[in-house]
């Protein structure tokens, strides 16, 4: 299957940090933690230090206005979560600065947020078919759903 | 233009110490991750070690970890690579190397040093 | 860690030649792939990121392809100044790795 969607060929412009500093809990309120240097994994924690705080930035892009591309860094890091595949983990890469534009290939840096309520989804838009998602003991990954969860409550104003 | 020169290599003995450094110009040296990757003479390349752009996070190769240290000092441009407990097989030429301007590490590398030879006397 | 096969090891071309270089990974890396050309006495010179993007200044006779696990650098004219040793980089994990490097030298 080809690597990247037919939206890779946008460009998403950068408007400004829209978050600082979130948690971000699975339906089965498990929080994301980081696994390791490159992988991140939810777990059940009782101390939210160990959660890893997310900001999230906003972008526009020329053609679609209906949906909210953003891009995910843990905060106070230069580290910004990044798409791979179905049922392969989410990475996270180091960048010196938040990119101002993105295309092409790029767009594995971007997801689509989504709101219905209290639930929150970030569908890839490399991947439009695929969210990022929690699975039991193991890393936080890209999955179209079942029996991962795609679906996330995000806990504010925990710096 | 982005330069990355090395100094440090010569000749030393198996079992000693010898620190390498980068010194860099050209690009805001504290926003970019840093690599050592190094070549044996006839050989391929063989990534060694890099340190993040604050120098909090350190990756090392395995054929390296608990010998080799990466550091940088970003108020004077410079990245070190201290190498203790030297062995024959650590006998290469050693390029300080920078990432492209997005993703620095893991990254491609797009800014490389001229290298910097490690010999052994015997 | 993952590991990095190139084939050939080495390969005997012509100027004008189509030369086709493969690279392997030990496992998944979706586009995270660089090619790099290097000549005897220099640095590594990138020509290729993310599997299919150039590099600036490249020469568009440089081309790249794959995802997953298998890659393709390849020169659709084999000119003078490409003789060298290519060697692909995996960059989907922090550990970077290598492969083996393939030779492109004078039939």
């Known amino acids: 299957s080809a690597p990247f969607s037919f939206l890779s060929n946008m460009t998403y412009h950068f408007i400004r940090i829209i978050k600082h500093e979130f948690i971000l809990n699975d339906t089965l309120n498990q929080t994301i933690i980081r696994a390791n240097d490159q992988y991140l994994t939810a777990a059940a924690i009782h101390n939210l230090d160990e959660a890893v705080k997310f900001d999230m930035g906003a972008y526009t892009s020329s053609k679609d206005d209906t949906k909210v591309p953003v891009i995910l860094r843990i905060s106070k890091t230069q580290l910004y979560v990044s798409a791979q595949d179905e049922d392969q983990p989410v990475l996270l890469k180091e960048m010196p600065e938040i990119p101002k534009t993105i295309t092409g290939s790029e767009t594995n840096f971007l997801f689509f947020w989504e709101t219905h309520g209290t639930k929150n989804y970030f569908i890839s838009v490399a991947h439009p078919n695929l969210f990022i998602a929690t699975k039991h003991d193991n890393w936080v990954c890209l999955a179209k759903g079942l029996p991962s969860i795609t679906d996330f409550q995000i806990l504010e104003n925990q710096a | 233009q982005v330069q990355l020169v090395e100094s440090g290599g010569g000749v030393v003995q198996p079992g000693r110490s010898l620190r390498l450094s980068c010194t860099a110009s050209?690009?805001?040296?504290?926003?970019?991750?840093v690599h050592w990757v190094r070549q044996a003479p006839g050989k391929g390349l063989e990534w060694v070690a890099a340190v993040s752009y604050d120098g909090s996070n350190k990756y090392y190769a395995e054929s390296v970890k608990g010998r080799f240290t990466i550091s940088r000092d970003n108020s004077k441009n410079i990245l070190f690579l201290q190498m203790d407990s030297l062995r024959l097989e650590d006998t290469a030429v050693y390029y300080c190397?920078?990432?492209?301007?997005?993703?620095?590490?893991?990254?491609?590398?797009?800014?490389w040093g001229q290298g910097t030879l490690v010999t052994f006397s015997s | 860690d993952i590991q990095m096969t190139q084939s050939p090891s080495s390969v005997s071309a012509s100027v004008g030649d189509r030369v086709t270089i493969t690279c392997r990974a030990s496992?998944?890396?979706?586009?995270?792939l660089a090619w790099y050309q290097q000549k005897p006495g220099k640095a590594p010179k990138l020509l290729i990121y993310?599997?299919?993007n150039l590099e600036t200044g490249v020469p568009s006779r440089f081309s790249g392809s794959g995802s997953g696990s298998d890659f393709t650098l390849t020169i659709s004219s084999l000119q003078p100044e490409d003789f060298a040793t290519y060697y692909c980089q995996q960059t989907s994990s922090f550990l970077l790795s290598f492969g083996g490097g393939t030779k492109v030298e004078h039939k």
């Open positions: 993310e599997a299919s």
């Open positions: 190397a920078r990432g492209r301007p997005k993703v620095v590490i893991p990254a491609p590398l797009a800014h």
């Open positions: 496992q998944g890396i979706s586009s995270w």
């Open positions: 050209g690009f805001t040296f504290s926003m970019f991750g």
